[in-house]
């Protein structure tokens, strides 16, 4: 039995950081503001300004559950949301205008990295409590899609996308937010 | 190590409002998330909501979505809970708990009493 898939009821999304950041300043603006809104002159894309690209990132906190059993404590871990684009270009909090061009690359926002976690299960009925390793995401990243490439082959955003990735084992986190639930491993 | 206090609970009619409040200290963490839960008589606690560093990212349970605003003030290491329309369901200890992001919630506050009447 794996884990029950999550309900995604966070109700805000935070810019896309690294896996450490200093926390930002307490007076920061985020990009879909309104006062960000409004077409810019010219909107090239340029696949080398990776700071050009925005992935938005999700948090929230539930209980792992597996069969009849529960976490001793609760986790949080991201969810990878939203469509990435420049970021000058992602759509305002109102108009929900996409301004890039329809004919362009496709950008996903996927997990990046992970981190595994020890977690205690506590199991009714008085069965001992088992321990167990799950994954859980510590950042998202964006990833692009061209119409010219096979569509399950994703390539990492930035200089190293014109790297071929043959022979590369798909990651298990090149997969949709809702899919983003944490994975039990073998920790046995 | 982290040190937690929470206040504000007590005693409030249904309908009523209360703000509950988390106070930090000795916080190493440079990315974290703080949460509230809650646990009712014979019942497991619960997830109510939660908060990221910045507080630009915020987590609310379904049942509370609408009544609870989860807010935080850094420089006062602090972050609260703004409870309205107030039911008997929401009877129990809130506890207040933070946890490096990803990861479990490991620090944890002693907990402050609700308790709605009709």
């Known amino acids: 039995q794996g884990w029950q898939a999550f309900r995604n009821d966070a109700t805000e999304v935070i810019p896309g950081l690294g896996e450490y950041p200093e926390p930002p300043p307490e007076n920061n603006q985020t990009m879909n503001r309104a006062e960000n809104g409004g077409r810019p002159p010219h909107h090239p894309y340029d696949a080398k300004d990776v700071s050009e690209y925005s992935c938005r990132e999700l948090h929230y906190t539930r209980f792992l559950t597996d069969g009849p059993c529960r976490s001793a404590k609760p986790v949080t871990e991201l969810v990878c949301s939203g469509q990435c684009g420049p970021a000058r270009l992602l759509p305002n909090a109102i108009g929900r205008v996409k301004w890039w061009r329809p004919n362009g690359p496709d950008f996903r926002c996927i997990p990046d990295r992970y981190r595994a976690q020890r977690v205690q299960l506590l199991c009714p009925g008085g069965a001992a409590p088992r321990s167990r390793k799950v994954r859980l995401v510590a950042s998202c990243k964006c990833k692009r899609l061209t119409r010219f490439h096979n569509q399950s082959e994703l390539k990492d955003f930035g200089p190293e996308t014109a790297r071929p990735q043959k022979g590369r084992k798909p990651r298990p986190g090149a997969r949709g937010a809702k899919a983003n639930q944490a994975e039990l491993e073998n920790a046995y | 190590e982290v040190q937690l206090v929470e206040s504000g609970g007590g005693l409030v009619q249904a309908g009523g409002s209360l703000r509950l409040s988390c106070v930090a200290s000795?916080?190493?963490?440079?990315?974290?998330?703080t949460g509230w839960f809650r646990q009712a008589p014979g019942k497991e606690r619960e997830v109510v909501a939660s908060?990221?560093?910045?507080?630009?990212?915020?987590y609310y349970a379904d049942s509370v979505k609408g009544r609870f605003a989860i807010s935080r003030d850094n420089a006062k290491n602090a972050v609260y809970l703004q409870m309205n329309s107030l039911n008997l369901e929401d009877t129990g200890v809130y506890y207040c708990?933070?946890?490096?992001?990803?990861?479990?919630?490991?620090?944890w506050g002693q907990g402050t009493q609700v308790t709605v009447s009709s």
């Open positions: 000795g916080r190493t963490l440079r990315r974290y998330v």
């Open positions: 708990a933070e946890a490096e992001l990803p990861g479990t919630y490991d620090y």
């Open positions: 908060i990221s560093w910045s507080g630009e990212s915020t």
